[in-house]
């Protein structure tokens, strides 16, 4: 014969456990129903009556099957440097992540507690390590033969153009300026277009451009903000 189905509340077998989506109520000493996500226990079970569940009140939630007397409060509205990537609903908490150009300086279990603006490398310095959802940009001085003339959280140091005749030599924050001689030029993508260079950049190693990262949803543990690197500008 098939085993008889027990309806909650029921007393478990000695040493037995309650079934999935049930809990053992110590007071009633019975297996009772849990409440589904989005609800909470309004009235706890007794020996003769099962748990009474009710919907979560505005701005509160439960994510799991539960028997809590009150739903959990959703987190505060996202701040101006954040975007809401998950709204507060009866079943889930609000999740705030950093908007593009910012990174998470202080994480929480889901989303970000504190966003900080990505460091911008000033002219003469380029991005050595791009920012991620949880780490700041690292700047480095442009090495001889390379330059950066921007204040940017994404631009790397780029090689100077090669001139037959140099009008103005390049430095860490400015490209070389060539005299107008031959119209021939072959330049790497993204280089500054100044008058008439003639040869290629083949004798320079072109650094691989770092991806421009827009912080998205990341639930990693926080990487603490690094100290201001040489050449960074606080914006």
């Amino acid at each position: 014969l098939p085993a008889q189905v027990a309806f909650t509340p029921y007393a478990p077998e000695p040493g037995g456990t309650c079934r999935l989506r049930e809990y053992y109520d110590q007071t009633a000493q019975m297996c009772c129903s849990k409440c589904p996500p989005g609800q909470h226990a309004k009235v706890f079970c007794t020996k003769t009556s099962d748990t009474v569940c009710d919907s979560c009140e505005d701005s509160t939630y439960t994510q799991l099957w539960n028997w809590v007397p009150e739903c959990l409060s959703c987190g505060s509205r996202c701040s101006s440097d954040q975007v809401e990537t998950q709204a507060c609903t009866r079943e889930q908490n609000r999740i705030c992540t950093c908007r593009p150009g910012w990174y998470c300086a202080l994480s929480k279990q889901e989303g970000c507690r504190l966003c900080a603006q990505l460091r911008k490398c000033r002219p003469g310095f380029g991005v050595a390590r791009p920012g991620t959802e949880t780490s700041d940009v690292v700047c480095k001085p442009c090495a001889p033969g390379t330059f950066s003339n921007t204040t940017s959280s994404t631009d790397i140091c780029r090689p100077h153009q090669i001139c037959h005749v140099v009008a103005i030599p390049g430095n860490a924050s400015m490209d070389a300026v060539c005299t107008s001689t031959s119209p021939t030029r072959s330049m790497a993508p993204g280089a500054v277009h100044l008058p008439q260079p003639v040869s290629t950049r083949s004798q320079h190693t072109q650094p691989t451009p770092a991806p421009s990262t827009a912080p998205g949803t990341s639930f990693l543990l926080p990487v603490g903000p690094s100290p201001p690197a040489e050449g960074s500008t606080g914006d």
Epitope: S55, D58, S59, S73, S76, R77, T89
Partner: antibody, heavy 120, light 108 residues
Framework: QVQLVQSGSELKKPGASVKVSCKAS????????MHWVRQAPGQGLEWMGR????????KHDPKFQDKAVLSSDTSVSTAYLQISSLKAEDTAVYYC?????????????WGQGTLVTVSS | DIQMTQSPSSLSASVGDRVTITCTAS???????LHWYQQKPGKAPKLLIY???NLPSGVPSRFSGSGSGTDYSLTISSLQPEDFATYYC?????????FGQGTKVEIK
């Protein structure tokens, strides 16, 4: 854009009932509450109750529990407030206002108000 | 019920003045659940500040809010002609949700 448009003014006799409507447009009725707030002439704002249009669940100020019936029809995106046993002191402007779930009850959009006058 | 008491009930001020309105709750209210509304004669109320200190888009930055527990305030840093109106605080912490009695800001 978000709009709440209420029905027109009403003149009623004491003891009668009135039903005020509030038609919502420009947003999804899911995950919002619709509140009713009244304002007697020259007086402040008084919260009467609210309805969750998705479920029909209502909550009232106990003061209005037997006086006001809140309902909604999601097929026409409209919330209703019915007030029974009208008295002269029920003369007021009645506003509907919405609050999105998760916004801690901040009523971000309001109807234009419906004046209900109770006079014999 | 949580009673919300605003002070002053009315005030006269000039354009450019700094104005502060206070709201005292009869029991503690979570700052997330405290809001302010502005109402002009013959018009519906308008959400001015939500969750104690946050401005909805379109609300000028001269408006600010602060507070916690039972004591909250709304400040207008430099009163403009369009700010003459009645202001209400509102708690959504515990049902029934209640409004303050209002503070009328008039032209001096």
């Amino acid at each position: 854009q978000v709009q709440l448009v209420q029905s027109g003014s009403e003149l009623k006799k004491p003891g009668a009932s009135v039903k005020v409507s509030c038609k919502a447009s420009g947003f999804n009725n899911k995950d919002i509450y619709m509140h009713w707030v009244r304002q007697a002439p020259g007086q402040g704002l008084e919260w009467m109750g609210r309805i969750d249009p998705a479920t029909g669940n209502t909550k009232h100020d106990p003061k209005f529990q037997d006086k006001a019936v809140l309902s909604s029809d999601t097929s026409v995106s409209t919330a209703y407030l019915q007030i029974s046993s009208l008295k002269a002191e029920d003369t007021a402007v009645y506003y509907c206002a919405r609050s999105p779930y998760g916004d801690f009850g901040a009523m971000d959009y309001w109807g234009q108000g419906t004046l209900v006058t109770v006079s014999s | 019920d949580i009673q919300m008491t605003q002070s002053p009930s009315s005030l006269s001020a000039s354009v450019g003045d700094r104005v502060t309105i206070t709201c005292t709750a009869s029991s503690s209210v979570s700052s997330n659940y405290l809001h302010w509304y502005q109402q002009k004669p013959g018009k519906a109320p308008k959400l001015l500040i939500y969750s104690t200190s946050n401005l909805p888009s379109g609300v000028p930055s001269r408006f600010s809010g602060s507070g916690s527990g039972t004591d909250y305030s709304l400040t207008i840093s430099s009163l403009q002609p369009e700010d003459f109106a009645t202001y209400y605080c509102h708690q959504y912490h515990r049902s029934p949700w209640t409004f303050g009695q209002g503070t009328k800001v008039e032209i001096k």
